[in-house]
Interface confidence: low
C-alpha cells in the first residue's frame, strides 16, 4: 500500500513510509484541539488488494469551549450552533438594554484546551439623564432624575408676557432611546409672528386672521387677468417668515403673434405646492444630546443632532 490517508481531525502516529506491506497496520491519534470518544477505530490495515481498510476521523471531536449561559436580559447565540473551537459566540441584548463588553467572543485553542477569547458581556438597562430644560418652557416629569428606555417627556411653552404667545418649535414629545440618548433634540419656545401677507391684484381665500403665528397657513388666488407667480399656499415658519415667500399676481399679457390661451381667472406657475413641513429657511438650530454620566454607562457618541422644525 502507498501512504495511508490523511484526515482533518486525526494524524498518523509516527512518520509515514513510502510503502507498507500487506497486513501492516498504522495508528492515528486525534489532532491537537480534538478529543477521542470510543468506540470507533483509529487504525487501518493494508489490505490484500493493496488498499487501506476504511477508517474515518469520526471518533475525533473538536474541543469545545465552556458553556456560556444567556446574559441576564440578553441572549448568547453560538454561530453555527456549536461551542467548538474556531467558532464564535454572538451576544445580543433585549430591547431596552445595551451591551457592555465584547459583542463577539471567539472559541480559541490555548494549548489543548478551548477557551473563550474574553469575558462574556453584560446587558445593562438603558437609562437617560434628564432631558434639557428649555427657555420659556417646561417638560413633564421635571422632578425625575433617571429615565428608563422609552420613557417619554412632553414639552409645553410658558404663557408669554406680551400680547403674542410662545410657539413650540419642533416635536413636543421625546423619549429615552437606544444608547441612553433622547430620541431627538428638545423643542424651542419662542414668539413666532409673520407679517400680514399682502398680494396686490389677488385675494386671500383661506387662513383669514389678524395675526399669523407659527404654522399659520394662508391660500391665495389672483384676480381675473392676473396669474400667480409663486405658490398659492404659504406657511408661517419658525423664523417668522413666510415659506415659500408671499407670491405675486402678475398681469397676463396676450402674445403678439398667437391666439391668447384660454385662461381661468387665476393661474399658478408652480406645478407643485410645498407642504408646511417640507422646507425650512434660515439657519437650523443645533443641539448637543445629553451624555449619560452614571458609573458603568458608556458615554454615547457626542454627535450634534439637528432639531426638527
Amino acid at each position: 500500500c502507498e501512504e495511508p490517508p490523511t484526515f482533518e481531525a486525526m494524524e498518523l502516529i509516527g512518520k509515514p513510509k513510502p510503502y507498507y506491506e500487506i497486513g501492516e497496520r498504522v495508528d492515528y491519534k486525534c489532532k491537537k484541539g480534538y478529543f477521542y470518544i470510543p468506540p470507533l477505530a483509529t487504525h487501518t490495515i493494508c489490505d490484500r488488494n493493496h488498499t487501506w481498510l476504511p477508517v474515518s476521523d469520526d471518533a475525533c471531536y473538536r474541543e469545545t469551549c465552556p458553556y456560556i449561559r444567556d446574559p441576564l436580559n440578553g441572549q448568547a447565540v453560538p454561530a453555527n450552533g456549536t461551542y467548538e473551537f474556531g467558532y464564535q459566540m454572538h451576544f445580543i441584548c433585549n430591547e431596552g438594554y445595551y451591551l457592555i463588553g465584547e459583542e463577539i467572543l471567539y472559541c480559541e485553542l490555548k494549548g489543548s484546551v478551548a477557551i473563550w477569547s474574553g469575558k462574556p458581556p453584560i446587558c445593562e438597562k438603558v437609562l437617560c439623564t434628564p432631558p434639557p430644560k428649555i427657555k420659556n418652557g417646561k417638560h413633564t416629569f421635571s422632578e425625575v432624575e433617571v429615565f428608563e428606555y422609552l420613557d417619554a417627556v412632553t414639552y409645553s411653552c410658558d404663557p408669554a408676557p406680551g400680547p403674542d404667545p410662545f410657539s413650540l418649535i419642533g416635536e413636543s414629545t421625546i423619549y429615552c432611546g437606544d444608547n441612553s440618548v433622547w430620541s431627538r433634540a428638545a423643542p424651542e419656545c419662542k414668539v413666532v409672528k409673520c407679517r400680514f401677507p399682502v398680494v396686490e391684484n389677488g385675494k386671500q381665500i383661506s387662513g383669514f386672521g389678524k395675526k399669523f403665528y407659527y404654522k399659520a397657513t394662508v391660500m391665495f388666488e389672483c384676480d381675473k387677468g392676473f396669474y400667480l407667480d409663486g405658490s398659492d399656499t404659504i406657511v408661517c415658519d419658525s423664523n417668522s417668515t413666510w415659506d415659500p415667500p408671499v407670491p405675486k399676481c402678475l398681469k397676463v399679457l396676450p402674445p403678439s403673434s398667437t391666439k391668447p390661451p384660454a385662461l381661468s381667472h387665476s393661474v399658478s406657475t408652480s406645478s407643485t405646492t410645498k407642504s408646511p413641513a417640507s422646507s425650512a429657511s434660515g439657519p437650523r438650530p443645533t443641539y448637543k444630546p445629553p451624555v449619560s454620566n452614571y458609573p458603568g454607562y458608556p458615554k454615547p457618541e457626542e454627535g450634534i443632532l439637528d432639531s426638527l422644525d
Epitope: E63, P66, Y67, R69, L72, G101, K119, I122
Partner: antibody
Framework: QVQLQQPGAELVRPGASVKLSCKAS????????INWVKQRPGQGLEWIGN????????NYNQNFKDKATLTVDKSSSTAYMQLSSPTSEDSAVYYC???????????????WGQGTSVTVSS | DIVVTQSPASLAVSLGQRATISCRAS??????????MNWFQQKPGQPPKLLIY???NQGSGVPARFSGSGSGSDFSLNIHPMEEDDPAMYFC?????????FGSGTKLEIK
C-alpha cells in the same frame, strides 16, 4: 428531563476507598459542570469540588484536596468521586449537582441527585 | 474563601405572614453586573432544591411567593404568604468563585 442518578447507599470499611457515581441524562453532559456536595447528618452543606466533563478540568475545595478525586466518563455521561482512606468523619450524604458557567463565575446548582449515603464502619 | 453568614438560625412564622431570611458574604459576590448569590430549600430526606439564583431570579417551577433581593454582600430571601408546605431548611450559597460556600442554614417552622 434533566436527571442525575446516584446509588442510594454505600457501606465502606475504614481505609478502603470508595467510588461514588452520578449518571446524567436529559441534557448535554459535556456542557455543564458537575459539582459534589457533602452533608453530614443534621449539618450544613459543604462543597467538595467540580469537574467540567468536556475536558475533565477540576476545581477542588482545599479541605478535600487529598480526600476526593473527581473523574468523568463521557461515553456513559457519568461523573465519579473517589474518596480515599475513609474514616467515620467521611460518613455523610454526598450529592452531585449540575451547574452552569458564566465568564469566571457560576450560576446556581440547578439540578441535584438524590444523594448517596456513605457509612464508614467496620 | 468567601464566608457566608446566614441569620437567623431558626424562625417561626404564622401561616399567611412573611418570613425573611438574611445572608451576608464576607466580600461582594457581584461580577459582570450579576450577584452570584443563590437560595435553596431542603426538606428532610431530600436534596436541596434551587429557589432563587443570581440574587433575584426564580428557579424553574418555584412559586411567586418566594422572592430574593440584594446585591454586593447583603441579600435576603422573602416568603410571603407563608404556606403549610414551606417549613424546611433554607440555605444561601455564593457561586462567584470557588470554593462555593454555603450559609449555615435557617430552620423555618410554622408558629
Amino acid at each position: 428531563q434533566v436527571q442525575l442518578q446516584q446509588p442510594g447507599a454505600e457501606l465502606v470499611r475504614p481505609g478502603a476507598s470508595v467510588k461514588l457515581s452520578c449518571k446524567a441524562s436529559g441534557y448535554t453532559f459535556t456542557a455543564f459542570w458537575i459539582n459534589w456536595v457533602k452533608q453530614r447528618p443534621g449539618q450544613g452543606l459543604e462543597w467538595i469540588g467540580n469537574i467540567y466533563p468536556s475536558d475533565s478540568y477540576t476545581n477542588y475545595n482545599q479541605n478535600f484536596k487529598d480526600k476526593a478525586t473527581l473523574t468523568v466518563d463521557k461515553s456513559s455521561s457519568t461523573a465519579y468521586m473517589q474518596l480515599s482512606s475513609p474514616t467515620s468523619e467521611d460518613s455523610a450524604v454526598y450529592y452531585c449537582a449540575r451547574s452552569d458557567y458564566y465568564g469566571s463565575s457560576y450560576y446556581a446548582l440547578d439540578y441535584w441527585g438524590q444523594g448517596t449515603s456513605v457509612t464508614v464502619s467496620s | 474563601d468567601i464566608v457566608v453568614t446566614q441569620s437567623p438560625a431558626s424562625l417561626a412564622v404564622s401561616l399567611g405572614q412573611r418570613a425573611t431570611i438574611s445572608c451576608r458574604a464576607s466580600e461582594s459576590v457581584d461580577n459582570y453586573g450579576i450577584s452570584f448569590m443563590n437560595w435553596f430549600q431542603q426538606k428532610p430526606g431530600q436534596p436541596p432544591k434551587l429557589l432563587i439564583y443570581a440574587a433575584s431570579n426564580q428557579g424553574s417551577g418555584v412559586p411567586a411567593r418566594f422572592s430574593g433581593s440584594g446585591s454586593g454582600s447583603d441579600f435576603s430571601l422573602n416568603i410571603h404568604p407563608m404556606e403549610e408546605d414551606d417549613p424546611a431548611m433554607y440555605f444561601c450559597q455564593q457561586s462567584k468563585e470557588v470554593p462555593f460556600t454555603f450559609g449555615s442554614g435557617t430552620k423555618l417552622e410554622i408558629k
